[in-house]
């Protein structure tokens, strides 16, 4: 008879994670007597996958009934494939022997590649908020995919971004891979409602990419603009001064009124008005009894927003000479300074 040949007809087999892989092997002869074994890898470090002779291989089933003597099909099926199963599998015929069976002939090998889906992309933004016109970085990570080929895109409000850097690790062969990408985004005042999207396309996703999102509201801080004005009052001995705090984000805001540098009142913003762009407005007012002042009054609206250094705007409230002479008894209308406030933001 011709010498036995071990035929592995497929050079490669690709299987999706979780499925079963069938590795085909046929012999051309029954001789010599001895077991068939399947190994992953070659050489001294090869891993035994199946031994016809003995052992418990719960994930491996033989495709044919090996107890039939005329059976020459030694194909196996491996269930519940994971990326860790990737590698080259060899069907090997051994000749019965002692102290060990003797390797007689090996098949050429079948490379098993495992298609594993990438994990849902996780997008994370900067640890601290930044203000408009500044650039912030967003990272996107996904793991556990195979094969290595993968496409990652960044979008901001549907517009594709170009300023990003992507790495796929490891660089060499591996059972599965990870992707890490960092995108640089320039913030604008209108970005409170903006989103960045990391989109991943992979062969396992069948044209339906995975997306991870992050809201720029978590990354942006829009500092408020302040305007201090005086409102007309009927009572001649009272002045109503308002501080309009506009277009700020996030909500956290504390306002302090100072009269000639002395704290008059502190309040925390509560009932806010939300603008279309997601920023907030708030107004605070201060009622000043002009009779209590013999001299001009500098009123300062000081705002601490989102734990940042305070900003302030001042307003000079003039007390008329007539009121100064008669002191607090005079109930005439106080002369007001020009409507233009005193400058100052500190």
């Amino acid at each position: 008879e011709d010498e036995l040949q071990v035929i592995q007809p497929e050079k490669s087999v690709s299987v999706a994670a979780g499925e079963s892989a069938t590795l085909r092997c046929a012999m051309t002869s029954l001789i010599p007597v001895g077991p068939i074994m399947w190994f992953r890898g070659a050489g001294a470090g090869r891993e035994l996958i199946y031994n016809q002779k003995e052992g418990h291989f719960p994930r491996v089933t033989t495709v044919s009934e090996l107890t039939k003597r005329n059976n020459l099909d030694f194909s196996i099926s491996i269930s519940n494939i994971t990326p860790a199963d990737a590698g080259t599998y060899y069907c090997v015929k051994f000749r019965k022997g002692s102290p060990d069976d003797v390797e007689f002939k090996s098949g050429a090998g079948t490379e098993l590649s495992v298609r594993a889906k990438p994990s849902a992309p996780v997008v994370s933004g900067p640890a601290v908020r930044a203000t408009p016109e500044h650039t912030v970085s967003f990272t996107c990570e996904s793991h556990g995919f195979s094969p290595r080929d993968i496409t990652l895109k960044w979008f901001k409000n549907g517009n594709e971004l170009s300023d990003f850097q992507t790495n796929v690790d490891p660089a060499g062969d591996s059972v599965s891979y990870s992707i890490h990408s960092t995108a640089r985004v320039v913030l604008t005042r209108g970005d409170v409602h903006s989103q960045v999207i990391c989109e991943i396309a992979h062969i396992t996703l069948q044209g339906d990419p995975l997306r991870g999102t992050a809201n720029l509201s978590e990354a942006i801080r829009v500092p408020p603009t302040l305007e201090v004005t005086q409102q007309p009052m009927r009572a001649e001995n009272q002045a109503n001064v308002t501080c309009q705090v506009s277009n700020f984000y996030p909500r956290g805001l504390q306002l302090t009124w100072l009269e000639n540098g002395n704290v008059s009142r502190t309040e925390t913003a509560s009932t806010l008005i939300e603008n279309k762009d997601g920023t907030y407005n708030w107004m605070s007012w201060l009622l000043v009894n002009t009779c209590a002042h013999r001299d001009d009054v500098v009123l300062t609206c000081q705002v601490e927003h989102d734990g940042q250094q305070a900003v302030s705007k001042s307003y000079a409230l003039e007390i008329s000479a007539h009121q100064k002479e008669h002191g607090s008894d005079i109930t005439h209308e106080a002369a007001l300074a020009p409507t233009a406030p005193l400058g100052g933001s500190g």
Epitope: V33, I36, K53, R69, N70, G97, S98, P99, D101
Partner: antibody, heavy 118, light 107 residues
């Protein structure tokens, strides 16, 4: 049903000859290594001879040159031609099938008695 | 030739007992060891191959172990039908050889 049935045993004088037959049913005999095993009265088992699927033959030392194992595929039968018989060849002879891949004995016939005596 | 030595040669036991028979090869036989059961006037019956694998239809009370030169056959709970002679056999290389047998008798 897989079965082996031996025949051809009997009483023979020392120096005489006998041909044992083993008819196989339920499987193709030529696809298996086949064996003859004997058991002298009140003694243990002794392997005698084997024939491989390629027609290769093997014998225990005491029968070499006197016994010949063969098979006839068309009849799905195994044979043991015994010449120059001796008193010590007296035994029950069993036809045995070797296992699928390792030649472990799995199927035994019921045996046939060979008595060598004058 | 490879010599096979069984011990004990005979063994008395009671129904329900657990018994162990040992077999030693004169040289390493890998795990190409078989066990057979034979009752008087009957052909041997194959129990175990490759030291520990049970032939089809053999009850799980029979178990085998060992590799290299030392092997054991264990019957976990003896029943009346288990009283018989047991043989080990090496089949790694020709000539295949048997142990001398262990006769298991009822006490």
């Amino acid at each position: 049903e897989v079965q082996l049935v031996e025949s051809g045993g009997g009483l023979v004088q020392p120096g005489g000859s006998l041909r044992l037959s083993c008819a196989a049913s339920g499987f193709t005999l030529s696809s298996y290594d086949m064996h003859w095993v004997r058991q002298a009265p009140g003694k243990g088992l002794e392997w005698v001879s084997a024939i491989g699927t390629a027609g290769d033959t093997y014998y225990t030392g005491s029968v070499k040159g006197r016994f010949t194992i063969s098979r006839e595929n068309a009849k799905n039968s195994l044979y043991l031609q015994m010449n120059s018989l001796r008193a010590e060849d007296t035994a029950v002879y069993y036809c045995v099938r070797g296992g699928v891949w390792d030649d472990a004995f799995d199927i035994w016939g019921q045996g046939t008695m060979v008595t060598v005596s004058s | 030739d490879i010599q096979m030595t069984q011990s004990p040669s005979s063994l008395s036991a009671s129904v329900g007992d657990r018994v162990t028979i040992t077999c030693r090869a004169s040289q390493d036989i890998n795990n190409y060891l078989a066990w057979f059961q034979q009752k008087p006037g009957k052909a041997p019956k194959s129990l175990i191959y490759t030291a520990s694998s049970l032939h089809s239809g053999v009850p799980s009370k029979f178990s085998g172990s060992g590799s290299g030169t030392d092997f054991t056959l264990t019957i976990s709970s003896l029943q009346p039908e288990d009283f018989a002679t047991y043989y080990c056999q090496q089949y790694v290389s020709y000539p295949y050889t048997f142990g001398q047998g262990t006769k298991l008798e009822i006490k």
